[in-house]
């Protein structure tokens, strides 16, 4: 079906991956579609097959090289097209001139760990994964802590407006189980968005010392 509402969105992870999602209302699940990448100043062309992720959306990853290799720069433009098979020919369903550093979404932060925990506070650190050296320190983070009896959506967001890969959580309740998540975003790019949330890190505050005021 051609007349359904379509959407084609791609993000660059800043190193060697462009991830794309194509959605179209009313499209047939068994339609064969692919994303074709044609850079303006590189010798390679790349194609990935769009695979269904839900009733009306498909996704694929253009893997440009080794995970930590810097495959694109701020001056690159990659023309991305969604091509769907119609009989014996391929039809262009969507097209964009993709500017990688205007469309960034980094990988979720990794290696979350508790550096130090007390009764009322906890120091947590993390690392960023596959992030370009071009950013230098131009990154920001959001973090959230899941308290007992609440949902992630209710958790207040803590904003770190600089490249700070640690946080000291305070005013915690003693002897309580918490979970913590963090995400990262470069400051660069008109269409840049937050990374996925990290895997949650579970930790427990220390119990209050007996006979002491808490």
């Amino acid at each position: 079906a051609v007349n359904g509402t379509s959407q084609f969105t791609c993000f660059y992870n800043s190193r060697a991956n462009i991830s794309c999602v194509w959605s179209q209302d009313g499209a047939l699940q068994d339609t064969s579609c692919q994303v074709h990448a044609w850079p303006d100043r590189r010798r390679w062309n790349q194609t990935c097959e769009l695979l269904p992720v839900s009733q009306a959306s498909w996704a694929c990853n253009l893997i440009l090289g080794a995970p930590d290799s810097q495959k694109l720069t701020t001056v690159d433009i990659v023309t991305l097209r969604v091509l769907c098979r119609e009989g014996v020919r391929w039809r262009v369903m969507a097209i964009q001139d993709f500017k990688p550093f205007e469309n960034l979404r980094l990988m979720a932060p990794i290696s979350l760990q508790v550096v130090h925990v007390e009764t009322h506070r906890c120091n947590i650190s993390w690392e960023i994964s596959q992030a370009s050296h071009y950013f230098e320190r131009h990154l920001e983070f959001e973090a959230r802590t899941l308290s007992p009896g609440h949902t992630w959506e209710e958790a207040p967001l803590l904003t770190l407006k600089q490249k700070q890969e640690w946080i000291c959580l305070e005013t915690l309740t003693p002897d309580t189980q918490y979970e913590f998540q963090v995400r990262v975003k470069p400051l660069q790019g008109e269409f840049t968005t937050w990374s996925p949330w990290s895997q949650p890190l579970a930790f427990r505050t220390k119990p209050a010392a007996l006979g002491k005021d808490t």
Epitope: V2, N3, T5, S6, F8, T9, W38, D40, I77, T79, R81, R91, V92, M93, A94, I95, Q96, D97, F98, K99, E102, N103, E190, F191
Partner: nanobody, 126 residues
Framework: QVQLVESGGGLVQAGRSLGLSCAAS????????MSWVRQAPGKGLEWVSS????????HYADSVKGRFTISRDNAKNTLYLQMNSLKPEDTAVYYC???????????????????RGPGTQVTVSS
């Protein structure tokens, strides 16, 4: 705020050429796909042509294919439409339009624009 201003329209004889321009401001021009649409007297809006942000992809309505050429100069924030072998049925108000993202959809190219200029009148006499 986004501004699009068309120019270059006028009265021309059939078979002749005319070039339209659209000066854009208020947004990062080369981050967005652009298009030309037109409205003939007493008719609805008709999509004419679209172009990607860097100008590497273009599409045309069958009615203008081979006669019209869309282009852009991102250094000048300007969109162009070169119209050759004009016909009386090309008579219309021509509008340039900005897509809401860097993407456009060739099967439904009229969809997805969020701003349009005031238009410029093109009249083709026989």
């Amino acid at each position: 705020q986004v501004q699009l201003v068309e120019s270059g329209g006028g009265l021309v004889q059939a078979g002749r050429s005319l070039g339209l321009s659209c000066a854009a401001s208020g947004f990062t021009f080369d981050n967005y796909a652009m298009s030309w649409v037109r409205q003939a007297p007493g008719k609805g809006l008709e999509w004419v042509s679209s172009i990607t942000g860097a100008g590497r992809g273009t599409h045309y309505a069958d009615s203008v294919k081979g006669r019209f050429t869309i282009s852009r100069d991102n250094a000048k924030n300007t969109l162009y439409l070169q119209m050759n072998s004009l016909k009386p049925e090309d008579t219309a108000v021509y509008y340039c339009a900005k897509y809401s993202s860097s993407t456009y959809y060739p099967p439904t190219p009229a969809r997805g624009t969020d701003y349009r200029g005031p238009g410029t009148q093109v009249t083709v006499s026989s």
